[in-house]
């Protein structure tokens, strides 16, 4: 007996589709060998129609595919637009030839069953409504009109013109006439369910002179759309339910046995398993909306359904749309840490992957916010200025070509904890989610800058030093000047690296930056950081204030300039939250607060590359003028 298993008999009707699953034993060879589907001829020959090597016969062109699921030890043959010519004997199998391991499948495609010749067929989706047209002769105008549903023995009343209504149609069925036309009546049935499918008879009058019409009502469950996504990538469920449910709450749920568990809805419900990686976005007033899930996991695979109902929960008789999501474990998206840990006052460097084929795409970093339907306002991007409340402590370093960009956030507080998304204006599958956890610091930071009260005097020389521990000895140290376009690395040489590597004196490890002579443009945030090649590590930040020399004093040291900078920053946070509220007032904002900006620059990625120094790790540009001498003391 064959170790391959599948359905021995498959029966369907013309125009429909089949999805045949074949099961194979769990071995590495089986998972990787060729899979095929062939048709057996009278001679015993089996002619390949489709195989996993990419072969597709002419008769299957545009209507069939074969998908291998190595993690389930199955492969699936999907065939659409069936005709009676597809009836026959087939084999699904494994091996380089069609004489390998195989399983016999018989496929029978029948004609669509014949109905009485005068039958009118109405085909509707679940949850929709149907209006059945019932013509009659003028002499039956005064008579009773009715619609009944055929059962085995009788015809069960649905509704009649005397306002009798079957209990299962109360509130759903209406019998009416239009205008002055006395030759047609109509029956509208709303919130259709599977149980409404069947044969109906509408009738006007009684006895032999009655007008009758046969109606076949077909109520279809939506065919699930198949979605194939990579592990760690993202998926968007585009749900279009129609104008009639535009004002109802929307939901996405996942089938679980006989229930459908809501994952997210527009009433604020959200499954904790999707915290930080899901958004629901109302698209327009026509009942369209979308749900975006990032950071796909193996366990996210399954049968999803979207719908609309005032409760935000699935209800029978309301329109739905369905998908079958498959998550491919052989992913092109690199496996990165999904949780990054930092401490208060410290910093984190987050490596964001992007499709290496799209190195010129614009890169962004946004913070996922779960309130309402969820949204992800952009905090920084290659052409998006840093949000004001992140001034001096957030920068994006683009490293063109290597499939990674880095986002650095320093001066961490516990309020920074949360979920962040890496995204580009290119391949949307590469959206990834990072959870940032911030713990209270229990020790001194690794990098410390002196002096901490950094006020430089115009025209004079000013030096700041960055102390680092021996564990950073072999790493590259750098200073950069922060602007809301990035942190421009200043050229420096670290003389500490020339010392004997045998010993390391904790107290003397420092890299200094000197401004000589100090100018007004030097005022601002500076970062001291470490990195190894293109991999960024810790950073610390200092605000350098620039003041004019006061008479009678060669050096003024006012109260902590950084404290002043921080006060200003807190004021900015208040302002920015106000402007964000204004932003939220825009009708139907997208999931990203700066989405319009992303879309607008989307097509200009080539022409408008960020100008060299905005976050360029190796650009020696404008702030490296001759007045800056960087040396180690």
């Amino acid at each position: 007996k064959s170790p391959i298993f599948g359905p021995q008999e498959v029966s369907s009707i013309e125009g429909d589709s089949v999805s045949i699953t074949c099961y194979y034993p769990d071995t590495s060879v089986n998972r990787h060998t060729r899979k095929y589907w062939c048709r057996q001829g009278a001679s015993g020959m089996c002619t390949t129609l489709i195989s996993s090597n990419g072969y597709l016969s002419k008769e299957y062109s545009g209507r069939a595919n074969l998908i291998n699921f190595p993690e389930n030890n199955t492969f699936v043959i999907n065939i659409e637009q069936l005709t009676q010519d597809d009836t026959g004997s087939y084999k699904c199998g494994l091996g380089t030839s069609n004489r390998g391991l195989s399983f016999d499948v018989s496929l029978e495609v029948s004609q669509v069953p014949e109905l009485p010749s005068d039958t009118h067929v109405y085909t509707k989706d679940i949850g929709r409504n149907v209006t059945i047209e019932c013509p009659f002769k003028r002499e039956n105008a005064p008579s009773k009109k009715s619609l009944c549903k055929k059962t085995n023995q009788s015809c069960e009343l649905v509704i009649d013109s005397t306002e009798k209504v079957n209990p299962s149609y109360i509130g759903r069925a209406k019998l009416f006439m239009k205008g002055t036309d006395l030759t047609v009546f109509y029956v509208n049935i709303s919130h259709l369910t599977h149980n409404d499918a069947g044969l109906y008879i509408c009738q006007a009058g009684e006895g032999p002179s009655a007008d009758k019409k046969n109606v076949d009502l077909q109520v279809l469950a939506p065919e699930p759309e198949l979605l194939y996504k990579d592990l760690r990538s993202s998926v968007t469920f585009e749900c279009d339910l129609g104008r009639e449910v535009a004002n109802e709450a929307k939901y996405l749920c996942r089938m679980n046995k006989e229930t459908c568990d809501v994952i997210i809805n527009t009433l604020g419900k959200r499954d904790p398993d999707f915290e930080g990686r899901i958004l629901i976005t109302p698209k327009d007033d026509n009942g369209r909306f979308s749900v975006l899930i990032t950071g796909l996991r193996k366990e996210d695979a399954g049968h999803y359904q979207c719908g609309a109902h005032s409760s935000g929960l699935p209800q029978e008789g309301w329109p739905i749309q369905t998908w079958q999501l498959f998550v491919n474990e052989e992913s092109t998206i690199p496996n990165r840490r999904s949780v990054v840990k930092g401490v208060t006052g410290g910093s984190v460097a987050i490596a964001c992957p992007y499709n290496p084929k799209e190195s010129s795409s614009l890169k962004y970093w946004c913070r996922w916010e779960g309130d309402g339907n969820g949204h992800c306002p952009v905090l920084v991007g290659t052409q998006a200025q840093v949000q004001e409340e992140y001034e001096g402590r957030l920068a994006l370093f683009d490293q063109p070509g290597n499939g990674t960009y880095t986002v650095i956030l320093n001066q961490l507080t516990t309020e920074d904890a949360g979920f962040y998304w890496c995204l580009t204006n290119g391949d949307s599958r590469w959206r990834t989610t990072i959870e940032l956890q911030v713990a209270e610091a229990t020790r001194e930071p690794n990098l410390e800058v002196t002096p901490q009260n950094a006020t430089a005097v115009l025209g004079e020389t000013f030096t700041v030093s960055c102390h680092y521990p021996c564990k950073f000895y072999s790493q590259e140290k750098y200073w950069c000047k922060w602007s809301n376009k990035g942190c421009h690395i200043l050229p420096s040489h670290d003389e500490g690296a020339r010392q004997s590597s045998v010993s390391c004196d904790q107290s003397s490890q420092l890299v200094s930056m000197t401004l000589n002579p100090v100018s007004k443009e030097d005022e601002g945030w500076y970062w001291c950081g470490v990195k190894q090649g293109q991999t960024y590590g810790e950073t610390t930040a200092i605000y350098i204030a620039v003041e004019e020399r006061t008479r009678g004093s060669s050096h003024v040291n006012p109260t902590d300039a950084n404290a002043r900078a921080k006060v200003a920053l807190e004021e900015e946070v208040v302002d920015s939250s106000i402007s964000e509220k204004e932003n939220k007032a825009i009708p139907n904002p997208g999931p990203f607060a700066n989405e319009r900006e992303i879309q607008n620059v989307g097509d200009q990625a080539q022409e408008n590359r960020a100008s060299g120094d905005a976050g360029s790790a190796d650009g020696q540009s404008r702030s490296s003028s001759s007045k800056h001498h960087h040396h180690h003391h």
């Epitope: 298993f5 359905p7 008999e9 029966s11 369907s12 429909d16 045949i20 099961y23 006989e258 049968h303």
Partner: nanobody, 126 residues
Framework: EVQLVESGGGLVQAGDSLRLSCAAS????????MGWFRQAPGKEREFVTT??????????YYADSVKGRFTISRDNAKNTAYLQMNSLKPDDTAVYYC?????????????????WGQGTQVTVSS
């Protein structure tokens, strides 16, 4: 919940036929497949046959031991599955269980089924 009730079991001679019925009630619209398993005394429950459906399309799966002798069918309107057993052998003696599933990854695996009937005894004497 879905309730399943089997009927049609009994004592027959080898070579005879028997027809089992499995009537489903409750939230049957959520079911996607119905099948039959059997369990002989002292043995594990084994797969016999399953029918799954999607719209007008039906898929029928059979164990090698019953292929060509047993036929599964269903009446959608009655929410009932049938097992027509021909050319019965003494080896077919067992309690036959009806099972229903909302999602089936592998029809041969009993744990894939969500609902089970109480079982009906089939005895084939030689």
């Amino acid at each position: 919940e879905v309730q399943l009730v089997e009927s049609g079991g009994g004592l027959v001679q080898a070579g005879d036929s028997l027809r089992l019925s499995c009537a489903a009630s409750g939230r049957t619209r959520t079911t996607y497949g119905m099948g039959w398993f059997r369990q002989a005394p002292g043995k594990e429950r084994e797969f016999v046959t399953t029918i799954t459906w999607s719209g007008p399309t039906n898929y029928k799966y059979y164990a090698d031991s019953v292929k060509g002798r047993f036929t599964i069918s269903r009446d959608n309107a009655k929410n009932t599955a049938y097992l027509q057993m021909n050319s019965l052998k003494p080896d077919d003696t067992a309690v036959y269980y009806c099972a229903a599933s909302t999602v089936l990854t592998d029809p041969r695996v009993p744990t894939e089924y969500d609902y089970w009937g109480q079982g009906t005894q089939v005895t084939v004497s030689s």
